[in-house]
């Protein structure tokens, strides 16, 4: 008789995770006779997948009927693939005995498990940053095999260049994770804008997964102060506004002083949104001119997101004669804007001052 | 190791049935065929039946095919072998045996059921 | 059906000798490149033991002074130099077909 042989057909065999797997091995004689195993790897260390005549394996059926007469195919299905179960898998003969004896094996099939990569997930600073910071995002997806992947970042739909990523691990794995870190300049207008992680990967059949971060979350966009003033009333009192202009988030809380003196102070809430996502407040004083001798100093205070507050300042003249009908009661604005330590560029603050 | 343990021996009147079974331990019985074989006093071999306990597939033999029949209780890896309209010359010893090749052989024996019919 | 016819029904060999038993088939047991016979040994009291299978193959744990040979009709058991514990009934078995056996060769020690 002929020198038995064990065949097994494929080298190798890429499964989809989630789906079976089958792999195929017959034997070229019934001679010996003996069982026909299943390792997943060689040596001592090799893990038994299935044998044909003991133990119990769920997961594993073989292809043909093991009473069938003259069966000589020893295939096996593998069902529910995980990347776990990548490797490869060795069909062995052994010759029937008290143990049975090792005989011939196959020369191996890798089993490689296309798995598919987790949805994105992306996720921004821990703190808001001004315009012209820099801020990372970073996006991680796991879970999937074989290892290349392409990873893309966008911010409005425009493809971004400043971006770093890692696959791991290095070497061979049953499956692999990427990370990427993408740096992205803020502006004024970013308010409403998006990054966007898209991965792409043999598994997805060409629709890339996308995970997104809304910018609202990682910026900060600084108030523009303003002061206005309307004529002297019938009643000696003067009504002055502090206009807090295109700031976000809407987290600000406003206070006026008088010389110094506390006065008043308000905390913004249920604002209306502007179109680029800011918001506007506007806050009124009315001063009492005749309850002054002296010119009054005001100042607007806004602690906005809880950054060191802004102050704008504001002088109120009182005339000399303040009891005399049809009298002037001057009012000049004395410019000063003190910021804290705050160091706020105001690049388009010209484009709004009439903005009320 | 591969064990077949058959039930104890049975007297019986001429015209009654019997019913023999096999324990198998030590390998997969759904993977295995069992037969059933049986021996007079002082004769030879005679080969009665087999089953596939995977999907119990029976092969008689022609003498047996309308007073004997097989099957299997998967649950508890025990083949039956049941004999109608008992004999005088039914007395026999009756074996179970595993086929382990699936070549129609007999590579495992059970030690045997003395069925005694008498009146 | 089948039928196998061993001889000789009964055998005498001195210890050490070679014995030898032989089936003839009524027809071809060959099939698929293999000669469907086996080769049994029951000893009193005992149930058989499969010795040889496809006609030349021992079968696990079998000393090699049990062969078996032949194809087509005709096969033969040759046991090359008898010992005491062969004293034994030997019998041959067909499955090209449903399984048959032959009447036995009781085999004892001149």
């Known amino acids: 008789e002929e020198e038995l042989q064990v065949i097994q057909p494929e080298k190798s065999v890429s499964v989809a995770a989630g789906e079976s797997a089958t792999l195929n091995c017959t034997a070229t004689s019934l001679i010996p006779v003996g069982p026909i195993q299943w390792f997943r790897g060689v040596g001592p260390g090799r893990e038994l997948i299935y044998h044909q005549k003991e133990g119990h394996f769920p997961r594993v059926t073989p292809v043909s009927d093991p009473t069938k007469r003259n069966n000589m195919d020893f295939s096996i299905r593998i069902s529910n693939i995980t990347p776990a179960d990548a490797g490869t898998y060795y069909c062995v003969k052994f010759r029937k005995g008290s143990p049975d004896v090792e005989l011939k094996s196959g020369a191996g099939t890798e089993l490689s498990v296309r798995a598919k990569p987790s949805a994105p997930v992306v996720s921004g600073p821990a703190v808001r940053a001004t315009a012209e910071h820099t801020v990372s995002f970073t996006c991680e997806s796991h879970g999937f095999s074989p290892r290349d992947i392409t990873l893309k970042w966008f911010k409005n739909g425009n493809e971004l260049s400043d971006f770093q990523t890692n696959v791991d691990p290095a070497g061979k794995s049953v499956s692999y994770s990427i990370r990427s870190t993408a740096r992205v300049v803020l502006t004024r207008r970013d308010v409403h804008s998006q990054v966007i992680c898209e991965v792409a990967h043999v598994t997805l059949q060409g629709d890339p997964l996308r995970g997104t971060a809304n910018l609202s979350e990682a910026i900060r966009v600084p108030p523009f102060l303003e002061f206005t003033q309307q004529s002297m009333r019938a009643d000696n009192q003067v009504n002055v506004t502090c206009q807090v202009m295109k700031f976000y988030p809407q987290r600000l809380q406003l206070t006026w002083l008088e010389n110094g003196n506390v006065s008043r102070t308000e905390m913004a809430s249920a604002l209306p949104e502007n179109k680029d996502g800011t918001y506007n407040w506007t806050s009124w004083l009315l001063v009492n001119v005749s309850a002054h001798r002296d010119d009054v100093k005001l100042t607007c205070q806004v602690e906005h997101d809880g950054q060191p507050a802004v102050n704008k300042s504001f002088s109120v003249k009182v005339s000399a004669h303040p009891k005399e009908q049809g009298s002037n009661t001057a009012a000049e604005n004395t410019g000063t804007n003190e910021r804290g330590s705050s160091d706020y560029k105001d690049d388009d603050d010209k484009h709004h001052h009439h903005h009320h | 190791q591969v064990q077949l343990v058959q039930s104890g021996a049975e007297v019986k009147k001429p015209g009654a049935s019997v019913k023999v079974s096999c324990k198998a331990s030590g390998y997969t019985f759904t993977n295995y065929w069992i037969n059933w074989v049986r021996q007079a006093p002082g004769q030879g071999l005679e080969w009665i039946a087999m089953?596939?306990?995977?999907?119990?597939?029976?092969h008689y033999n022609q003498i047996f095919k309308d007073r004997a029949t097989l099957t299997t209780d998967t649950s508890t890896s025990t083949a039956y072998m049941e004999l109608r309209s008992l004999r005088s010359d039914d007395t026999a010893v009756y074996y179970c045996?595993?086929?382990?090749?699936?070549?129609?052989?007999?590579?495992?024996w059970g030690r045997g059921t003395l069925v005694t019919v008498s009146s | 059906d089948i039928v196998l016819t061993q001889s000789p029904d009964s055998l005498a060999v001195s210890l050490g000798e070679r014995a030898t038993i032989n089936c003839r088939a009524s027809?071809?047991?060959?099939?698929?490149?293999?000669?469907?016979i086996f080769w049994y040994q029951q000893k009193p009291g005992q149930p058989p033991k499969l010795l040889i299978y496809l006609a030349s193959n021992r079968d696990s744990g079998v000393p090699d002074r049990f062969s078996g040979s032949g194809s087509g009709t005709d096969f033969t058991l040759t046991i090359s130099s008898l010992q005491a514990e062969d004293v034994a009934v030997y019998y041959c078995?067909?499955?090209?077909?449903?399984?048959?056996f032959g009447q036995g060769t009781k085999l004892e020690i001149k």
């Open positions: 027809k071809s047991v060959s099939s698929s490149g293999y000669n469907w």
């Open positions: 078995q067909e499955s090209r077909e449903l399984p048959t």
């Open positions: 045996a595993m086929d382990y090749g699936s070549l129609y052989a007999m590579d495992y």
């Open positions: 089953i596939d306990p995977s999907d119990s597939e029976t």
